[in-house]
């Protein structure tokens, strides 16, 4: 039977002689040269040759494991004389053993990593990996060990895994942010003679909130005019924070001080400044100086750094209110006055009052804005603000007069204020009632007595407090008429009634009835209106057929009474 072990051969042999691989040997070989060894298969006769007498195998060429890691050859042992096999043909392996001809190569030339500042020692940063093309199954040619060449004492690397960790306590980003670490990967388990490769790891410390905000000064002073409307920014304060991003975000608040109600502080997200703004209207005459306590704090606090102290700071803000020459202020936002429409010229209606709110208390003068009183119906006493009439009024023409009064500082005419003045004209019974319309009515020749032929209505331009109450009667000259009568309905209407049976249009075609209408206000006003009644021919249903008088015999057909 065959006697061999697996054959091994080192790759990339550099000797001048053929490289000895091993010996094929059969236990049938008596050493007398009767056996002949034959080699076939992968690379036989080319890469590998055999001494047919001894069975010694040699490699003729420099081999490279990466071309073919294993060669499978066939061995035969035959009787030299007969050519018959002494052993069955058998296969064997020549395994090319790797020499350490490949250095470890990192998967990246440069790694980039981040780790939070102030991280505990041993915090994972990044894992680097190097690969080695040599055979990992043989020797240590591909056994890579990692070490740190640059970056101590800040970082360390696990020799077998390539995991980089923090190695120093309290690494402060605010002190140093960037680190360049150089890692070496060395094969042969890191032993002498091993091949190596390096990579650079750029490590950035990321920010944590380990710094509180700090005001660069303890006191700030700002000035603002008393006229500043709510929302007006009057000054900016800024606390500095050595952190970045959200860890440097600052919220400002007013925590104390007499101006708490009068001022606000808002945070400018862009600049991280606190903007002091006016909250309510200021008044120099009431308070000239305010003192506030403003606090700057981090909204995002990390509990593990609370021991470093409170993550807030305070400063005092002094606000000086500057006096502004303010216009006069009227005692009311608007004035409502009333006057009877029968008031004489120069009748005083009432008065307005305005005062300079400034400490100087400048005197004021009053005037009427003539754009609002084009007809100059009213006037004002420039000294005391009394309003009086300068023309006669008529409620029925204009019920309300809306005028504007101006108050101007005498010493500074630029400072003026305006106030609306609403003057109501009160009613006086100065208009007589009159017919609501022109009344021309008709009566049939065959009309019966006490027939209603017309209802009368009256109107009055006045507006009595208790409402209109009109009375109707025939004028004295027609009161005794035997033709028509008037009936007052006591509801501001009256009826014209026939007083006899039958009318002759040939005798009298038209009657003119004078009617007196009176109101019951003081002084009583009355007027006389005329109702025209025409006599008409009617059919038996009472429908008028003809009211024309052209067929009348008498030339005089008009009467004002009987």
């Amino acid at each position: 039977s065959w006697m061999w072990n697996q054959f091994f051969l080192l790759e990339e042999y550099t000797g001048s002689d053929y490289q000895y691989v091993g010996k094929l040997h059969s236990d049938q070989d008596r050493g007398d040269g009767s056996l002949k060894y034959i080699l076939s298969g992968d690379g036989a006769g080319d890469l590998f040759i055999i001494n047919e007498n001894t069975g010694d195998i040699q490699a003729t060429k420099r081999l490279d494991r990466e071309e073919k890691p294993v060669y499978i050859l066939r061995a035969q042992a035959v009787n030299r004389r007969t050519g018959r096999p002494v052993e069955p043909e058998s296969e064997f392996i020549i395994k090319i053993h790797d020499i350490n001809d490949n250095e470890p190569i990192f998967t990246k030339d440069v790694y980039t990593a981040t780790v939070p500042e102030m991280a505990d020692v041993g915090t994972f940063v990044v894992q680097v990996t190097a690969t080695d093309a040599d055979d990992p199954t043989y020797g240590n040619s591909a056994k890579v060990v990692y070490s740190i060449l640059q970056g101590q004492p800040y970082f360390s690397v696990e020799s077998e895994t390539g995991i980089i960790k923090t190695a120093l306590l309290n690494m402060d980003r605010e002190n140093r942010e960037q680190y360049q670490v150089v890692i070496q990967a060395k094969d042969m388990g890191g032993q002498m003679g091993g091949l190596s490769g390096t990579t650079t790891v750029n490590i950035t410390l990321t920010d944590v909130n380990d710094n509180p905000p700090r005001f660069p000064q303890s006191t700030y002073q700002f000035k603002t005019p008393e006229s500043s409307p709510p929302g007006t920014p009057i000054g900016r304060i800024k606390a500095s924070d050595a952190d970045v991003g959200e860890n440097a975000e600052i919220e400002y608040s007013i925590t104390d001080g007499e101006g708490h109600e009068m001022f606000d502080v808002i945070t400018d997200q862009e600049t991280q400044e606190g903007i002091i703004t006016v909250k309510k209207l200021l008044d120099f005459e009431k308070k000239k100086v305010y003192t506030l306590k403003v606090e700057a704090s981090n909204p995002h606090v990390e509990p593990r750094f609370l021991y470093l102290g409170p993550f807030k700071d305070s400063a005092t803000v002094r606000i000086v209110v500057d006096d502004v020459d303010e216009p006069p202020v009227f005692s009311k936002l608007a004035y409502i006055l009333q006057i009877r429409e029968d008031a004489r010229i120069n009748t005083t209606i009432g008065s307005v009052a305005a005062q300079d709110p400034d400490a100087a208390r400048n005197p004021v003068k009053y005037s009427v804005d003539r754009h609002t009183d084009m007809d100059r119906i009213f006037n004002i006493d420039s000294g005391n603000g009394s309003i009086f009439t300068s023309k006669l009024l008529d409620r029925e023409t204009l019920l309300w007069h809306n005028i504007t009064v101006i108050a101007t500082e005498i010493n500074n005419p630029k400072q003026s204020s305006r106030v609306p003045l609403y003057i109501k004209v009160l009613d006086v019974n100065d208009n007589a009632p009159e017919f609501a319309e022109f009344y021309e009515t008709f009566v049939c020749e065959k009309a019966k007595a006490d027939q209603l032929i017309q209802t009368l209505r009256a109107v009055d331009k006045d507006d009595p407090y208790s409402g209109h109450q009109f009375s109707f009667s025939l004028a004295p000259e027609a009161a005794s008429s035997s033709n028509f009568t008037i009936q007052d309905n006591k509801d501001n209407t009256a009826g014209i009634l026939t007083r006899k049976n039958g009318y002759n249009r040939h005798e009298m075609s038209t009657y003119l009835l004078p009617v007196v209408i009176s109101d019951n206000d003081y002084p009583v006003q009355s007027s006389t209106g005329t109702v025209t009644v025409r006599v008409c021919a009617c059919d038996h249903h009472g429908n008028m057929q003809s009211c024309h008088a052209e067929a009348l015999i008498h030339p005089t057909g008009l009467s004002t009474g009987a």
């Epitope: 076939s40 298969g41 992968d42 690379g43 490279d64 990466e66 071309e67 073919k68 890691p69 294993v70 499978i72 066939r74 043909e89 058998s90 296969e91 392996i93 395994k95 001809d101 490949n102 190569i105 093309a133 055979d135 990992p136 199954t137």
Partner: antibody, heavy 120, light 108 residues
């Protein structure tokens, strides 16, 4: 001329078995190591298994190890692949190929392939 | 273990030069072979041992291997060269590894 011809493919249910054959002609079959390579539909080539010229040494891809067995009968100039415990992901065209020392141990020639479909 | 990476596709105009790459860590230390596969056909060896052409393969096919990249070059590409191309090498012991394949499209 040198030729390889595969057979034995077909439809089989998951968990089933199939035996592929590769008939060689035009060269001394017993002098060459042989390989099986497969190609899933629309995918690339995947090496499956190797057998040395006399059949003493065999080797398998991790994906088929323990389920597939490569063998040869040099007297019949035939290469075999016994496939057991088949899975859907074994669906592919299976090629046999000769390892040619003269071409730096590359594969030349290849058979035309046989389709194996694993589906329920 | 070596891993071979190929671009999924490469396009070239007729008569132009097509280059198909196969990359892997220190690939220069490994012998690379190239195969051509046309639709519905078996693969055909076009380059062996990095840069050698088997008999019957046109001269326009050539190969190179250095650093981390092996390259198959087809100069004066013809329409009939449109196919999938695969690189291959020996891995550890008796295992074989293929690249993912590159589809070569000849435009026009």
């Amino acid at each position: 001329q040198v030729q390889l011809l595969e057979s034995g493919g077909g439809l089989v249910q998951p968990g089933g078995s199939l035996r592929l054959s590769c008939a060689a002609s035009g060269f001394t079959f017993s002098s060459y190591a042989m390989h099986w390579v497969r190609q899933a539909p629309g995918k690339g080539l995947e090496w499956v298994s190797f057998i040395s010229s006399l059949g003493s040494y065999t080797y398998y891809a991790d994906s088929v190890k323990g389920r597939f067995t490569i063998s040869r009968d040099n007297s019949k100039n035939t290469l075999y692949l016994q496939m057991n415990s088949l899975r859907a992901e074994d669906t592919a065209v299976y090629y046999c190929a000769r390892e040619t020392a003269g071409y730096g141990y590359a594969f030349d020639p290849w058979g035309q392939g046989t389709l194996v479909t694993v589906s329920s | 273990d070596i891993e071979l990476t190929q671009p999924p596709s490469v396009s070239v105009s007729p008569g132009q030069t097509a280059s198909i790459t196969c990359s892997g860590d220190n690939i220069r230390k490994y012998v690379v072979h190239w195969y051509q596969q046309k639709p519905g056909q078996a693969p055909v060896l076009v380059i062996y041992r990095d840069n050698n052409r088997p008999s019957g393969i046109p001269e326009r096919f050539s190969g190179s291997n250095s650093g981390n990249t092996a390259t198959l070059t087809i100069s004066g590409t013809q329409a009939e060269d449109e196919a999938d191309y695969y690189c291959q090498s020996w891995d550890s012991f008796l295992a074989v590894v293929f690249g993912g394949g590159t589809k070569l499209t000849v435009l026009g």
